[in-house]
């Protein structure tokens, strides 16, 4: 069947989601099409708990997050609210700052070197983490 | 072995349509992207369409955007191209391709022979 | 979009020779550039894969070099096998992957 019941190779198990971290940058757009060609999406932060999971694998680097304002509000790219759900950005952020000098604002999120998160241009090329989550019928416990 | 093999290829009229299959062996099919990518006669490698592993995601080229689709029948371990309103410049080799996925970097690593599609009144 | 040039378009070399052909890309694609070889009336075959890694079973005299927008693949000793289309691909921009024109090696 097209369920997944276990993550796929070289994909980390974590609270019934698995996740893939690259160690080369993309910009933005093509690091969210790299996941979504491996059926995943762009990790979605959903908790503290989370958060420092992913900070832990990650390390001190500049990585992309499922996480954009390019059409106009902040969004979540697997549609988790954002008003209501986990933020972690730095002090003064997002600010879509704009002098850059590479044209337009900061559209993109993406965690920082200490974890927390900043806009920043999505053409950049950063790390990135996919996320896929497992499937629900899988997370019944056996029958016994 | 991985082997992938073409079949639906032909000779259609402009505005015409085609359907296009691969069929895959020796491999876990449904963990693998899967692509399109054609040659017209003397002419180099056209990239022309991509889906993931499950069929959840699908991108193409704007060349063919809005008249060609890529689906896939994972129970059958089968691609399929289906390919309307054709033009001439549509003429080509068409080669089916696994995408192969290795720290971030991609590739095609297993191709199939390809088939011929000929558009042409 | 990225464009893929490759120089040259064609060249002529004799068995033994040491042949290098370079694809340059439109902006930088860091690593991620893979090389393919092609023989008249068959499919591409993958030869090299982010930038530097031999696919499983290509003969250790082919090898890729580069970073950025300048890639190099080279041929050690050229064999008689060898005489066919090289292709550079990109796949920075997932998935636009973008293969460069080609370049033809044939005998001297």
């Known amino acids: 069947g097209s369920e997944r019941t276990c993550c796929p190779v070289n994909w980390v198990e974590h609270e019934r989601s698995c996740y893939w971290f690259s160690r080369s940058g993309k910009a933005w757009a093509d690091a969210d099409n790299y996941c979504r060609l491996e059926d995943a999406h762009l990790v979605v932060v959903t908790s503290w708990e989370e958060q420092k999971f992913v900070q832990h694998h990650i390390g001190p680097v500049n990585t992309w997050m499922g996480l954009h304002d390019q059409n106009g509000p902040w969004k979540w790219v697997d549609g988790t609210d954002y008003e209501t759900g986990f933020k972690n950005w730095r002090p003064e952020q997002p600010d879509d700052w704009y002098g850059h000098g590479l044209g337009g604002g900061e559209d993109c999120a993406h965690f920082t070197d200490d974890g927390r998160w900043n806009d920043d241009v999505c053409q950049r090329p950063y790390r990135w983490v996919c996320e896929t989550e497992l499937d629900k019928a899988s997370q019944e416990p056996p029958l016994l | 072995e991985a082997q992938l093999l073409e079949s639906g290829g032909g000779l259609e009229q402009p505005g015409g349509s085609l359907r296009l299959s691969c069929a895959a062996s020796g491999f876990t099919f449904s963990s693998y992207a899967m692509s399109w990518v054609r040659q017209a006669p003397g002419k180099g490698l056209e990239w022309v369409s991509v889906i993931s592993g499950r069929g959840g995601n699908t991108y193409s080229a704007d060349s063919v955007k809005g008249r060609f689709t890529i689906s896939r029948d994972n129970s059958k371990n089968t691609l399929y191209l289906q390919m309307n309103s054709l033009r001439a410049e549509d003429t080509a080799v068409y080669y089916c391709a696994s995408r192969l996925a290795v720290a971030g970097s991609e590739a095609f690593h297993i191709w199939g022979q390809g088939t011929m599609v000929t558009v042409s009144s | 979009d990225i464009q893929m040039t490759q120089s040259p378009s064609s060249l002529s070399a004799s068995i033994g020779d040491r042949v290098s052909i370079t694809c340059r890309a439109s902006r930088t694609i860091n690593n991620y550039l893979n090389w393919y070889q092609q023989k008249p009336g068959k499919a591409p075959k993958l030869l090299i894969f982010?930038?530097?890694s031999l696919q499983s079973g290509v003969p250790s005299r082919f090898s890729g070099s580069g970073s950025g927008t300048d890639f190099t693949l080279t041929i050690s000793s050229l064999q008689p096998e060898d005489f066919a289309t090289y292709y550079c691909q990109q796949t920075y921009s997932t998935p636009l992957f973008a293969f460069g024109p080609g370049t033809k090696v044939d005998i001297k």
């Open positions: 982010a930038t530097s």
